[in-house]
């Protein structure tokens, strides 16, 4: 049987059953999530659930830029240091860089410090690039 690889929306890239859209617009975390949702298909800010997925995303983004942090779908909505993925994925894979020094940093970004392979917490009202994800 010929199995057709699902197609992603124009400008999005495909990896292991998911489509990813990298947006170099500046949005705060919640506006970025709303914009991801607006693209339909059940899209949200991206969950990153394995090193393989992280590496693929990092490689893709590095082709565009290497200095700007990028919002992902991990946040601490109740501000209790109980982080969760906005798309409901389990919080099993973690790739935090170092220790948080607190101060109302309740949203997660891919950090440019380690070629986008590690995450940092930041203030959710910061306006940054963002990464969306959906399953086609």
């Amino acid at each position: 049987d010929i199995i057709m690889r699902p197609s992603c929306a124009p400008g999005w890239f495909y990896h292991k059953s998911n489509c990813y859209g990298y947006f170099r617009k500046l949005r705060n975390w919640s506006d970025a999530e709303l914009e991801c949702q607006s693209y339909g298909n059940g899209a949200h800010l991206a969950s990153i659930l394995s090193l393989k997925e992280a590496s693929t995303i990092a490689e893709y983004i590095s082709g565009y830029q290497r200095s700007q942090p990028i919002w992902i779908g991990l946040h601490d909505p109740q501000k209790r240091q109980q982080w969760q993925w906005i798309d409901g994925a389990m919080y099993l894979y973690r790739s935090w860089s170092g220790k948080s020094m607190g101060g109302n940093k309740h949203c997660a970004e891919m950090s440019s410090n380690n070629n986008f392979l590690t995450w940092s917490s930041n203030e959710c009202n910061k306006r940054q690039h963002f990464l969306c994800k959906y399953r086609p």
């Epitope: 209790r80 020094m101 917490s121």
Partner: antibody, heavy 122, light 112 residues
Framework: EVKVVASGGILVQPGGSLKLSCTAS????????MSWVRQNPEKRLEWVAE????????HYPDSVKGRFIISRDNDNHILYLQMNSLKSEDTAMYYC???????????????WGQGTSVTVSS | DVLMTQTPLSLSVSLGDQASISCRSS???????????LEWYLQKPGQSPKLLMY???NRFSGVPDRFSGSGSGTDFTLKISRVEAEDLGLYYC?????????FGGGTNLEIK
């Protein structure tokens, strides 16, 4: 050495107000979620208030909501609990508690102060 | 609110024996992120409570390996494999997955 020292507990009449303080030392206070937990004379524990590291988010159980206010002074490493409209059932030992965390992963209330006793009685 | 029910209320154990304390929640206490924030605390006579276990089965630093935690969903257990004199006191389970966080009523461990 991590220390959290609560103070301010006294005998107060029903309907009265009281402000508890907790002075923290030995850790980066501004990086930790903090709570107040109380223990009544029957030894039952009850979580009564929580505040996030930056001080802008708070949580309370229904039993104290609208009467108690938790706040913090990160510059001076002090946690507060303003208690208003006190009732006899608020009589308890009040503990100041640190939430253990790396910032990315909560792992329990790892340091408890020695407690300060509040008695509400006429 | 999540009701946490501990059994037994009191437990009398000989030194060297095993002790087991049960904690049952009125609903599942897995957080939306998949983690179960279930903790155990010990309050020794005249002292403040101290953290023993977090996230069901993780021992806090300095806690002896004779303490172990297990369970999932709504049923959790704290076991002390070989009870020592210093283990006496009040044991509390605590769920911090759902607001408001809630404690069990406590189990008093006595030495025979």
């Amino acid at each position: 050495e991590v220390k959290v020292v609560a103070s301010g507990g006294i005998l107060v009449q029903p309907g009265g107000s009281l402000k508890l303080s907790c002075t923290a030392s030995g850790f980066t206070f501004r990086s930790y979620v903090m709570s107040w937990v109380r223990q009544n004379p029957e030894k039952r524990l009850e979580w009564v208030a929580e505040i996030n590291d930056g001080g802008s988010y708070t949580h309370y159980p229904d039993s104290v909501k609208g009467r108690f206010i938790i706040s913090r002074d990160n510059d001076n490493h002090i946690l507060y609990l303003q208690m208003n409209s006190l009732k006899s059932e608020d009589t308890a030992m009040y503990y100041c508690v640190r939430h253990g965390s790396t910032g990315y992963d909560y792992f329990g209330m790892d340091y408890w102060g020695q407690g300060t006793s509040v008695t509400v009685s006429s | 609110d999540v009701l946490m029910t501990q059994t037994p209320l009191s437990l009398s154990v000989s030194l060297g024996d095993q002790a087991s304390i049960s904690c049952r929640s009125s609903q599942t206490i897995a957080h939306r992120n998949g983690i179960t924030y279930l903790e155990w605390y010990l309050q020794k006579p005249g002292q403040s409570p101290k953290l023993l276990m977090y996230k069901v089965s993780n021992r806090f630093s300095g806690v002896p390996d004779r303490f172990s935690g297990s369970g999932s969903g709504t049923d959790f257990t704290l076991k002390i494999s070989r009870v020592e004199a210093e283990d006496l006191g009040l044991y509390y389970c605590f769920q911090n997955s759902h607001l408001p966080p809630t404690f069990g009523g406590g189990t008093n461990l006595e030495i025979k």
